[in-house]
């Protein structure tokens, strides 16, 4: 009997075949397909789109292709009643007002229904007042401005620049603040690659180029109305004054053309350091307020966005597996855009609808997967992950029993120098094994791998030799799966030289020139970094749902929960004074984690030793692969974070998209000088470290012999 | 019974390389952490360089950083150290260890006999 | 320059006992596990204490090993000629992300 017993092909033609058929060409039509009209979450636009992706998948040979719809809180904004920001004299005339809308880009002029810049879910409100530039608005600007510089935000209307950080925490910081208002705008520092035309001559973000966006907190919480399960047709929907992670004081993000006119004025404290400046010509002065002649000027802001209850509809696609049907490998991106999404999301749906196409190809000729794969097009991303949330939390009992692994595909593309992949440690040895065998798409790697390019120009900064795979945190729909559900989650992209483009993310980020024409004029146009991805992804997905033993490798979460526990150590190694007075050990972590070291060996010895022919061994020693994920999930959650379950990660506190490692001990020592109770607050850590190691022990412990 | 067996030591020039093997056997290979360790005359043991199980995360000492690469075989049970620009104080008795614990480094339960590398023009 | 300090040496007659003292700092011993290794000469090392305190099958219940703090402590009773050999103490370093032997002592049998 073959390898794999699912399929009528010879095992090692399974996976060529499979990549053989991914064609970049397609790639690209169905990339242009997809960005000529915007598909904003909740428009009739984006249900029809759904309606065909939908068709072309049953089309492309999928068991069963069905939408999934909810009813969930959006937000747009007023269409007779625009968002804008002026300057106001003081008599209260409008001296100065923000665009309304961004010039459309060269064939677009006559497209309706694209939505004008605005933050979504702001509340509305008209506030006015003082200027302040508090930098990036992460945790640490604000510590600069409150502590050393004894500036105070309260009452004032913060500006900030995008980048470094999730655009939420930054209102959220400045709300702590006191503001009363937030103006988010792109610095030409951070959104403008020097040497690099603007479009539509280049792939830079022009003076009226706005980067739109959701500023929610919602920790995972999916629909602000009702967290934790989904908005069915008989939710139980919170009032809006309950409603999970929504901003308080009203939030706009404006161009830099726009922001130079109000920072040009700007007076009071000059910035602390070169760090706080960009590369407008502007002084970058902190304020608050005006300069000299412009003093009694004021900012005001006039935001009349509504949010709305509204439908949204998920595409999940089934191609049932032959030997274990009831074990759920998912591959999903989302559907919705702010506008074209000419990258963000349709480069990665594009993607996955050609894996669809090659996988369907092959079931055509009589093959399957040996496991269930399921095809997500998701909707809502862009509102905070909500059509992924929502059917996890409607499926939430299948997908702990049943969830091997999701993959994720928002975009394709965030630059073309190499690879980016962030996944759970149980995948490294995968993600390796695949790029070696795959051919890199990159210049002066002719007839090399993958693995070698990534290599040599993503380094590890901890293993030389080795390629950089990064934590997973949040900022996409992976979320639910992995932190709240404890599925192991990847995901890949091609990605920017981060050592030489210090940019945030990739300048036309959810702006209106994020068109189908910036991919195939800039960024890739044979369309071969795409395909790379492609196979990536595609290949994952194979090998999760193909191989007879889980391509999990447990060794690699004990590598890495070392490092982490050396990491956290050290950090709570700068207060040896308190670790002294109140006691505190990791004795227990570095046990646990030496623990999960030594069974997961023994695991993996008898691995290698088991009968694979014996199905039962076989499922067994597979559903202990699959459930190491899940075993780091703490059913009580992070403290006020209920929907972050995951002990080993988390995201940030301060930064949604960044992963954080032992989150718990983290955020207990986070500025632990400050605090008010430091005995309360080192009690707190104790805890922690008690989470973790317990955590950690107990899902060593479901490696170890069954009996 | 467990047994590791090096080879590939010698005499070199410095600014030459070196590649040690290391031979394992009578365990399962994969599951652990392999490490090298080395001696020089007449002084105590350095360790070198370690890679894990699994993937095979790659661990260097500061002194050889950069010139030294640490890698394995699963599928022939072999370590190696690739040693570059080799120096006279490079010299030492050089030991393959088997880590007791598993894929990261803890403990060394089984050495290997020690192989001699000299730098020396 | 190796960052766990012994004695260089240590002696004692036969039958009596001796202690070899490492010193380290918290982020090697204070949370790592220590082992000890004896080497023979013109031999190998020998595991002879693993995680602070257990023995590998094989060692005999002579030696025994303790940690404290940043401190660990190798005890040799009754001892006989055979014993005569260098050990070393040896452990994880958290900030160097390396292994760590100490300087070793020389046991002499008077």
């Known amino acids: 009997k073959s390898s794999n017993e699912a399929t009528n092909i010879t095992p090692k033609h399974n996976m060529k075949a499979f990549l053989d058929e991914l064609k970049a060409e397609n790639i690209k039509k169905f990339l242009y397909n997809f960005t000529q009209i915007p598909h904003l979450a909740g428009t009739e636009q984006n249900f029809q789109l759904a309606k065909q992706i939908q068709s072309q998948w049953k089309e492309f040979g999928l068991d069963s292709v069905e939408l999934a719809h909810y009813d969930v809180l959006l937000s747009y904004p007023n269409k007779t009643h625009p968002n804008y920001i002026s300057i106001i004299n003081e008599d209260g005339n409008e001296i100065f007002n923000t665009s309304l809308f961004e010039p459309p880009p060269p064939g677009y002029e006559n497209v309706s229904d694209i939505v004008p810049p605005f933050s979504a879910f702001s509340p509305q409100g008209m506030p006015e007042g003082d200027l302040v530039y508090v930098n990036y608005a992460r945790t640490e600007d604000f510590f600069k401005l409150e502590r050393d510089m004894k500036i105070n935000c309260s009452g004032k209307i913060v500006i900030a620049r995008y980048g470094k950080v999730f655009r939420g925490n930054k209102v959220k910081n400045a709300q702590l603040a006191g503001a009363k208002g937030v103006i988010l705008y792109s610095d030409p520092a951070d959104y403008f690659a020097p040497g690099v035309k603007s479009y539509p001559d280049g792939w830079n973000l022009p003076g009226g180029g706005v980067q739109r966006g959701n500023i929610l907190n919602l920790n995972g919480a999916g629909d602000p109305l009702t967290p934790g399960y989904p908005a069915n047709e008989y939710a139980y929907r919170r009032g809006i004054a309950e409603a999970v992670g929504l901003p308080s004081i009203p939030v706009h993000p404006i161009g830099y053309y726009d922001a130079q006119k109000l920072l040009e004025k700007m007076g009071g404290s000059a910035p602390p350091d070169s760090s706080w400046r960009g590369s407008l010509k502007v002084p970058y002065n902190v304020g608050p307020g005006f300069t000299g002649n412009f003093s009694t000027q004021k900012v005001k802001m006039h935001i009349h966005s509504t949010n709305e209850v509204t439908r949204i509809y998920n595409v999940i696609g089934t191609l049932r597996g032959a030997v274990e049907p009831d074990r759920y490998v998912i591959l999903g991106g989302h559907r919705d855009s702010w506008v074209f999404g000419g990258i963000d999301p349709q480069s990665g749906a594009a993607v996955v609808h050609e894996i669809v196409r090659s996988f369907g190809t092959l079931k055509k000729e009589g093959w399957r997967p040996r496991r269930t794969i399921l095809f997500a097009s998701w909707d809502a991303e862009e509102f905070g992950l909500l059509g992924s949330t929502e059917w996890a939390e409607e499926n939430s009992r299948l997908l702990q029993e049943r969830g091997v692994a999701y993959i994720n595909a928002d975009s394709s593309i965030e630059g073309n120098y190499t690879l980016r992949v962030d996944c759970t440690p149980l995948m490294y040895s995968l993600v390796h094994n695949l790029t070696k065998e795959l051919k890199s798409p990159d210049e002066g790697f002719e007839g090399k791998s993958l693995y070698e390019s990534w290599t040599k120009k993503s380094p590890s900064p901890e293993f030389s030799g080795m390629p950089r795979i990064s934590k997973l945190g949040s900022g996409n729909d992976f979320e639910v799966f992995f932190q709240r559900l404890g599925i192991a989650s990847g995901r890949a992209r091609y990605t920017k030289n981060w050592e030489t483009n210090k940019f945030s993310g990739y300048p036309l980020y959810h702006s209106v020139y994020e068109t189908y024409e910036l991919v195939e004029k800039f960024y890739d146009p044979m369309f071969k970094y795409h395909l790379t991805v492609a196979q990536v992804r595609g290949g994952m997905v194979f090998e999760l749902a193909n191989s007879i033993v889980l391509p999990f490798d447990c060794r690699d979460y004990a590598v890495v929960l070392r490092k982490y526990a050396d990491k956290i150590y050290s950090i709570s190694m700068k207060h040896p004074q308190e670790m002294k007075t109140y006691s505190v050990s990791f004795d227990s972590l570095f046990s646990a984690v030496k623990n999960f070291t030594e069974i997961a060996s023994k695991f993996s010895e008898r691995l290698q030793d088991f009968d694979k022919s014996n199905p039962i061994v076989l499922r067994m020693m597979n559903d202990q692969l699959m459930f190491l994920e899940r075993a780091f999930i703490d059913p009580l959650g992070l403290p006020d974070r209920p929907f972050y379950r995951h002990v080993i990660y988390a995201p940030s506190s301060h930064n949604k998209y960044a992963g954080e490692s032992f989150p718990g001990i983290y955020d207990a020592l986070f500025d632990i000088e400050s605090k008010v109770d430091p005995s309360k607050a080192w009690g707190e850590v104790k805890r922690q470290i008690y989470v973790a190691a317990f955590t950690v022990q107990a899902a060593a412990e479901t490696l170890s012999e069954v009996a | 019974e467990v047994q590791l067996v090096e080879s590939g030591g010698g005499l070199v020039q410095p600014g030459g390389s070196l590649r040690l093997s290391c031979t394992a056997s009578?365990?399962?290979?994969?599951?652990?952490?392999m490490s090298w360790v080395r001696q020089a005359p007449g002084k105590g043991l350095e360790w070198v360089s370690a890679?894990?199980?699994?993937?095979?995360?790659?661990y260097y000492a500061d002194t050889v950083k950069g010139r030294f690469t640490i890698s394995r075989d699963n599928s022939k049970n072999t370590l190696y150290l690739q040693m570059n620009s080799l120096r006279a104080e490079d010299t030492a008795v050089y030991y393959c260890?088997?880590?007791?614990?598993?894929?990261?480094?803890?403990?060394?339960?089984?050495w290997g006999q020690g192989i001699l590398v000299t730098v020396s023009s | 320059q190796s960052v766990l300090t012994q004695p260089p040496s240590v002696s004692a007659a036969p039958g009596q006992k001796v202690t070899i003292s490492c010193s380290g700092s918290?982020?090697?011993?204070?949370?790592?596990?220590v082992s000890w290794y004896q080497q023979l000469p013109g031999t190998a090392p020998k595991l002879l204490i693993f995680?602070?305190?257990k023995r590998p099958s094989g060692i005999p219940d002579r030696f025994s090993g303790s940690k404290s703090g940043t401190s660990a402590t190798l005890g040799i009773t009754g001892l006989q000629t055979g014993d005569e050999a260098d050990y070393y103490c040896?452990?994880?370093?958290?900030?160097?992300?390396?292994?760590?032997f100490g300087t070793g002592t020389k046991v002499t049998v008077l």
């Open positions: 009578g365990f399962i290979f994969s599951s652990y952490a």
């Open positions: 995680d602070n305190n």
């Open positions: 260890a088997k880590d007791g614990v598993g894929a990261t480094p803890y403990y060394f339960d089984d």
């Open positions: 918290s982020s090697n011993i204070g949370n790592n596990y």
């Open positions: 890679i894990s199980g699994g993937y095979g995360a790659p």
């Open positions: 040896g452990t994880w370093d958290s900030s160097l992300s390396a292994y760590v």
